[in-house]
């Protein structure tokens, strides 16, 4: 079942998927100036049996003014600069998704690729949440929405996370150092924070994840 | 289960100081920021100040900047904060609340007066 | 002065649904932040009521329910009893102060 709408918009924060599951779907989209070939795919599938999952189709663009180029090459290094990427700059990435079963690694760049990609998720994906450049997060950890089916309806969960601007600086004289904390994600206690909206962190996903505060207690 | 208990309230001079201190306990303190929030009496709730999981940044109300500190001792899963200067209008009860906040504890009463 | 308005209050009689209104700004609501209702009886803490926009925390009855859209959100509340009596904040994080923005509050008197 594909979920109804995109994963939900976090200011200051940009979201990733580690992994597809299976019936997800890739658009395949050409960067301006290309085409897809006349008889290429629409999208890219991601399918797969019990023990192993992989693209079908193959996205394959053309110049607009050229009929009949249809080579496919990957990408030179200044054209996947080119790719608007996602992908988290953080020491804390989660368990790697993609080697559990049903699921599809993100696919290979194809030539002359459009500079955003466009997913259609299927119920059951999650995806993950991380302040860009110059902003932090207020909670540690990943952030996490995962499109769910209530009541015959999909939605998606909202990821607990606040990403805030420049530091203030506020150590006053005599104020102690703030201390360093270990990355990574932190045991949990007894319970779980709610911090499960903007000023939090949410789920647990394998051993290393840690749920909100209360918020896990509440979805 | 959570548990948030508020201490170091009670009567001070205006000018004085006082040191407000929040004992966590039932969650992992470590991975939350924290907040101060306080309610004068009859009042609304006004959020004071603002502090990362790790103490690494801190935000503060307008109409404390200057005169409250906030802290976290993460080893001692405790947050404080220092008010220097303090004025009536700083009367309130004061609340220490954890993530959204989504929980609060039971609060500590300062009055300043002479 | 507020950052985020609120009726200072609301009544109802039991069994009647009751709306609270909140407004932001765009530096809050209408930033794309979460919004979260608090409800506070009298003489304790505020107490977590609706967490992002729309959820209910375990043990919150599906009498309460929030919505967003735009620069502003409410809350409702069906089904009026009279333990409903209490004061109802909303809260919001703004990216101008990067803090939590409060509501003045809303008094519900059940009549």
């Known amino acids: 079942e594909l979920c109804d709408d995109d994963p939900p918009e976090i200011p200051h924060a940009t979201f990733k998927a580690m992994a597809y599951k299976e019936g997800t779907m890739l658009n395949c989209e050409c960067k301006r100036g290309f085409r897809r070939i006349k008889s290429g795919s629409l999208y890219m599938l991601c399918t797969g049996n019990s023990s192993h999952s992989s693209w079908d189709n193959q996205c394959q663009c053309t110049s607009s003014a050229t009929r009949n180029t249809t080579k496919q090459v990957t990408p030179q290094p200044e054209e996947q600069k080119e790719r608007k990427t996602t992908e988290m700059q953080s020491p804390m990435q989660p368990v790697d998704q993609a080697s559990l079963p049903g699921h599809c690694r993100e696919p290979p760049p194809w030539e002359n690729e459009a500079t955003e990609r466009i997913y259609h998720f299927v119920v059951g994906q999650m995806v993950y949440y991380q302040c860009v450049q110059g902003y932090r997060a207020l909670h540690r950890g990943p952030a996490e929405s995962v499109c769910k089916m209530t009541h015959g309806k999909t939605r998606w969960t909202q990821p607990q996370l606040i990403c805030t601007g420049e530091m203030e600086t506020s150590q006053f004289p005599g104020e102690e150092k703030p201390q360093a904390s270990p990355e990574g994600r932190p045991e949990s206690e007894t319970s779980c924070l709610v911090t499960t909206t903007d000023f939090q962190i949410q789920t647990e996903m394998a051993a290393t994840m840690e749920t909100s505060i209360f918020t896990t207690e509440y979805q | 289960e959570v548990q948030l208990l508020e201490s170091g309230g009670g009567l001070v001079q205006p000018g004085g100081s006082l040191r407000l201190s929040c004992a966590a306990s039932g969650f992992t303190f470590s991975s939350y920021g924290m907040h101060w929030v306080r309610q004068a009496p009859g009042k609304g709730l006004e959020w004071v100040s603002v502090?990362?999981?790790?103490?690494?940044?801190?935000y503060y109300a307008d109409s404390v900047k200057g005169r409250f500190t906030i802290s976290r001792d993460n080893s001692k899963n405790t947050l404080y904060l220092q008010m220097n200067s303090l004025r009536a209008e700083d009367t309130a009860v004061y609340y220490c609340a954890a993530g959204v906040p989504d929980y609060w504890g039971q609060g500590t009463l300062v009055t300043v007066s002479s | 002065q507020s950052v985020l308005t609120q009726p200072p209050s609301a009544s109802g009689t039991p069994g009647q649904r009751v709306t609270i209104s909140c407004t932001g700004s765009?530096?809050?609501?209408?930033?794309?932040?979460?919004v979260h209702w608090y409800q506070q009886l009298p003489g304790t803490a505020p107490k977590l009521l609706i967490y992002s926009n729309n959820e209910r925390p375990s043990g919150v009855p599906d009498r309460f329910s929030g919505s967003k859209s735009g620069t502003s959100a409410s809350l409702a509340i069906s089904g009026l009893r009279s333990e409903d009596e209490a004061d109802y904040y909303c809260?919001?994080?703004?990216?101008?102060?990067?803090?939590?923005?409060f509501g003045g509050g809303t008094k519900l008197t059940v009549l």
């Open positions: 809260a919001a994080w703004d990216q101008s102060l990067n803090g939590p923005v």
């Open positions: 765009s530096s809050n609501i209408g930033a794309g932040y979460d």
């Open positions: 502090i990362s999981y790790d103490g690494s940044y801190k």
